[in-house]
């Protein structure tokens, strides 16, 4: 099955530093998602391969790719304390599948000793619960069902 | 939670044309990635086209050559131009952000029958 393989878990950085993050599929996608995930989940960027990426008005100009869509790493710079989150992939495939998650701690730089990573990932409960099947569900009560492959119909 | 709303089926007869729109509510549109779906009496709904936000473009097989989609960023629009119908391109339409397990819309009904 497809996977999102997302590192870091974790990092800790100061005001105004950078982080990497990547990640990484088997291929056989149309794009990928960063987000931000909270009480209301902010999409950051959509890269796909060939096509100019799109980005969130608050990361614009502080963003930057490497590689493919299929390994892709993304780099955000000059990092504030309101980017402190929990960053998770998300790949377009025939099922949506998502990364483990990225926890970024943004701090000042004094107080940096005061915030560590430990080494266990982001808590998966944070992350959209994966669709039950694939079947696709009557237009009746689809609206209580998981979403169906979302390009099945596609190559 | 966003919502959707699909408009623009009709009766129409084989060889003509009609152009879908579907209007979603809520913000960062320009980060959907919008579809459109089928579904014809008896059978399974199936995604007929779907554009990125990069405006890349996929269509299935059934449709390709004929049916045209495309988006409009500042009306949160999502539009389905469909061309030289065909009697067997009659089925409930929906709209569908792929991103997310969202509720879908009610459809709008396209039938094409001389």
């Known amino acids: 099955a497809q996977e999102v393989q997302q590192s870091p878990h974790c990092t800790t950085v100061p005001v105004g530093a950078s982080v990497n993050i990547t990640c990484s599929t088997s291929g056989g996608l149309r794009g990928i998602y960063l987000r931000q995930l909270g009480p209301q989940p902010q999409d950051i960027i959509y890269y796909e391969d060939g096509v100019v990426p799109t980005t969130d008005r608050r990361f614009r100009g502080r963003i930057d790719f490497s590689g493919s869509q299929d390994n892709l790493t993304i780099t955000m710079h000059r990092l504030q304390l309101s980017d402190t989150g929990t960053y998770t992939c998300q790949a377009i495939t025939e099922v949506n599948v998502y990364g483990s998650g990225t926890l970024v701690l943004v701090t000042e730089e004094q107080s940096q000793g005061w915030h560590r990573c430990s080494d266990a990932p982001p808590r998966a409960s944070a992350l959209p619960a994966p669709p039950t099947g694939s079947a696709l569900p009557d237009p009746q009560t689809a609206s209580a069902l998981p979403d169906p492959p979302a390009a099945s119909a596609l190559p | 939670q966003v919502k959707l709303e699909e408009s623009g089926g009709g009766l129409v007869q084989p060889g003509g044309s009609l152009r879908l729109s579907c209007v979603a509510s809520?913000?960062?549109?320009?980060?959907?990635?919008m579809g459109w779906y089928r579904q014809a009496p008896g059978k399974q709904r199936e995604l007929v086209a779907d554009i990125s936000p990069g405006n890349s473009t996929n269509y299935a097989d059934p449709v390709k050559g004929r049916f045209v989609i495309s988006r409009d960023n500042a009306k949160n629009t999502v539009y389905l131009q469909m061309n030289s119908l065909k009697p067997e391109d009659t089925a409930v339409y929906f709209c569908?952000?792929?991103?997310?397990?969202?509720?879908w819309g009610r459809g709008t009904q396209v039938t094409v029958s001389s």
């Open positions: 809520g913000s960062s549109f320009h980060f959907a990635f």
């Open positions: 569908r952000d792929l991103r997310s397990w969202g509720a």
